[in-house]
């Protein structure tokens, strides 16, 4: 017998062809011999089956000797053997209906697990293979699990169900809720304005939740909350904000914060958390602030940086257009009795300048 695979919720068309290319009498029945539909002349007649309101045919094809059975909004329990009786012949078609669903929401937080569950008719033994948007293949039976979802797992998952050498393909859209970057670093000279941006890696029509930025200043023994806010339909409203520093937060996405000036006491690292409505867990983004200060005190020219710098970063002091006078993998460098001129303090990573501060040394008379 012919095997046809269908997808839950879809429409399937089972074919039945007569040798005569004309409209003749036909009937479709299920395995219990209950009539589903048939014809009386040019009229469609329906039997007492459970498919009554979901079964149909194409009258336009009857004249060509084609008498299809169309079943809409397929259910797993529609899996059955369907018999077409035409011209004293019986054509049997076995319909197997499968469903594949994410057994949680399809909007999942980064790091959470995705479980796909296959619904299948009794007696079937399908195999499933899914391909993630980043090309990763996973195989399984009735359930497939992916732990520790990453940002690259956002998108359309394509799953193929194989049964009796026949295939049916499912597409499931998964949205991984995360910030675009797990971590970012901002380099500023003392006194400069600071802007922190926290763009999300997903878009949804209505976004509601609440968030907080905790800050661990390098000079402080413990972290403190800098700001708490609510998010309602993508509108940001500040609930509480520290008075030092004088932070401002933008009211529209992407989440955006500004400090009027970078100061050594603010250098450090922060953690912005966002709890979304109806979701367990939180989104996180780390943000780091590195602050540079160049000063001249009597005969000592000093350059310092505060904040989370990697050990491979180089701090140097040089007179403009000259070789570096001092260059160290440290957070402070100095030159005694500096020559007059424009001095540059540079923080660099493998030759790439991350931060630069200029200071003018006047001649001493």
């Amino acid at each position: 017998k012919k095997v046809v695979l269908g997808k839950k919720g879809d429409t399937v068309e089972l074919t039945c062809t007569a040798s005569q290319k004309k409209s003749i009498q036909f009937h479709w029945k299920n395995s219990n011999q209950i009539k589903i539909l048939g014809n009386q002349g040019s009229f469609l007649t329906k039997g007492p089956s459970k498919l009554n309101d979901r079964a149909d045919s194409r009258r336009s094809l009857w004249d060509q000797g084609n008498f299809p059975l169309i079943i809409k909004n397929l259910k797993i329990e529609d899996s059955d053997t369907y018999i077409c009786e035409v011209e004293d012949q019986k054509e049997e078609v076995q319909l197997l209906v499968f469903g594949l669903t994410a057994n949680s929401d399809t909007h999942l937080l980064q790091g959470q697990s995705l479980t796909l569950t296959l619904e299948s008719p009794p007696g079937s033994s399908p195999s499933v293979q899914c391909r993630s948007p980043r090309g990763k293949n996973i195989q399984g039976g009735k359930t497939l699990s992916v732990s520790q979802l990453e940002l690259q797992d956002s998108g359309t998952w394509t799953c193929t169900v194989l049964q009796n050498q026949k295939k049916v393909e499912f597409k499931i859209d998964i949205v991984v809720l995360a910030f675009q970057k797990a971590s970012s670093i901002v380099y500023k000279k003392e006194g400069e304005q600071v802007e922190f941006s926290f763009p999300l890696a997903f878009t949804v029509e209505k976004l509601t939740g609440s968030g907080e930025l905790w800050w661990q200043a390098e000079r402080a023994s413990s972290s403190k909350s800098w700001i708490t806010f609510d998010l309602k339909n993508k509108e940001v409203s500040v609930k509480w904000v520290t008075q030092d520093p004088k932070l401002q937060m933008g009211k529209k996405l992407p989440l955006h914060l500004t400090l009027p000036q970078a100061l050594p006491q603010y250098a450090g690292s922060g953690n912005l958390t966002l709890a979304l409505e109806a979701k367990t867990g939180k989104l996180h983004q780390e943000v780091n602030l590195v602050v540079m200060r160049a000063t001249q005190l009597q005969k000592n020219l000093t350059c310092e940086v505060w904040g989370p710098t990697s050990p491979k970063l180089m701090l140097s002091l040089k007179l403009e257009n000259k070789e570096a006078k001092v260059s160290k993998r440290e957070k402070a460098v100095w030159v005694l009795n500096p020559e007059a001129g424009m001095w540059q303090c540079l923080l660099s990573d493998s030759g790439q300048v991350l931060l630069e501060s200029n200071i003018k040394v006047l001649p001493t008379w």
């Epitope: 802007e195 309602k232 409203s237 401002q248 009211k251």
Partner: antibody
Framework: EVELLESGGGLVQPGGSLRLSCAAS????????MSWVRQAPGKGLEWVSG????????YYADSVKGRFTITSDNSKNTLYLQMNSLRAEDTAVYYC????????????WGKGTTVTVSS | AIQMTQSPSSLSASVGDRVTITCRAS??????LGWYQQKPGKAPKVLIS???SLQSGVPSRFSGSRSGTDFTLTISSLQPEDFATYYC?????????FGQGTKLEIK
């Protein structure tokens, strides 16, 4: 076409109250944030108060905080500004303004209603 | 609250002149700044939103730009109908704040 029409202005004594209304036509009121902006005679524009489309969040300039209350009635497509403890410096033309879909700018303004606080 | 410092407060110019008006924000405000034109006895009208987006129906001689926290409105060639008062408005966060205004007069 979207139109905003303010009403409720007038002469009031210091310490008195007034309620301004802003009737909107041609828009789904609950979709947009709205603001009240005022202009004292011969002076510049001053933002007074704002309300989110849902009506859940309200905001005020420091100069009116605790005295003015902004509300909206989506069923009537009307924005209100309840002004209590009025002072001479509240004398101004009060405009209501609708913000763009993503709060990008105040794209539609009413013609204004005049409030005079004087004894 | 974020302060918006607008300059100059008044400006005399002739038809055909190129004119620039500046607003400086006390905080970073991204591109969340608009420019508004107001004529005597009339409600303000938006010219530019989000720093540089020209509103429909606004002549292309108007343009906006940003450098850090400094925002500029430029009128490339003044026309008689451009003589009015211009305001910047930060809508980065509440409370919104306007600049003090620039009155553009005929020389």
């Amino acid at each position: 076409e979207v139109e905003l029409l303010e009403s409720g202005g007038g002469l009031v004594q210091p310490g008195g109250s007034l309620r301004l209304s802003c009737a909107a036509s041609g828009l789904t009121f609950s979709t947009f944030a709205m603001s009240w902006v005022r202009q004292a005679p011969g002076k510049g524009l001053e933002w007074v108060s704002g309300i989110s489309g849902s009506g859940e969040n309200t905001y005020y300039a420091d100069s009116v905080k605790g005295r003015f209350t902004i509300t909206s009635d989506n069923s009537k497509n009307t924005l209100y500004l309840q002004m209590n403890s009025l002072r001479a410096e509240d004398t101004a033309v009060y405009y209501c303004a609708k913000e763009g879909y993503n709060w990008n700018y105040m794209d539609v303004w009413g013609k204004g209603t005049t409030v005079t606080v004087s004894s | 609250a974020i302060q918006m410092t607008q300059s100059p407060s008044s400006l005399s110019a002739s038809v055909g002149d190129r004119v620039t008006i500046t607003c400086r924000a006390s905080h970073g405000i991204r591109n969340d700044l608009g420019w508004y034109q107001q004529k005597p006895g009339k409600a303000p009208k938006v010219l530019i939103s989000e720093t540089s987006s020209l509103q429909s129906g606004v002549p292309s001689r108007f343009s906006g730009s940003r450098s850090g926290t400094d925002f500029t409105l430029t009128i490339s060639s003044l026309q008689p109908e451009d003589f009015a008062t211009y305001y910047c408005l930060q809508d980065y966060t509440y409370p919104y704040t306007f600049g003090q205004g620039t009155k553009l007069e005929i020389k």
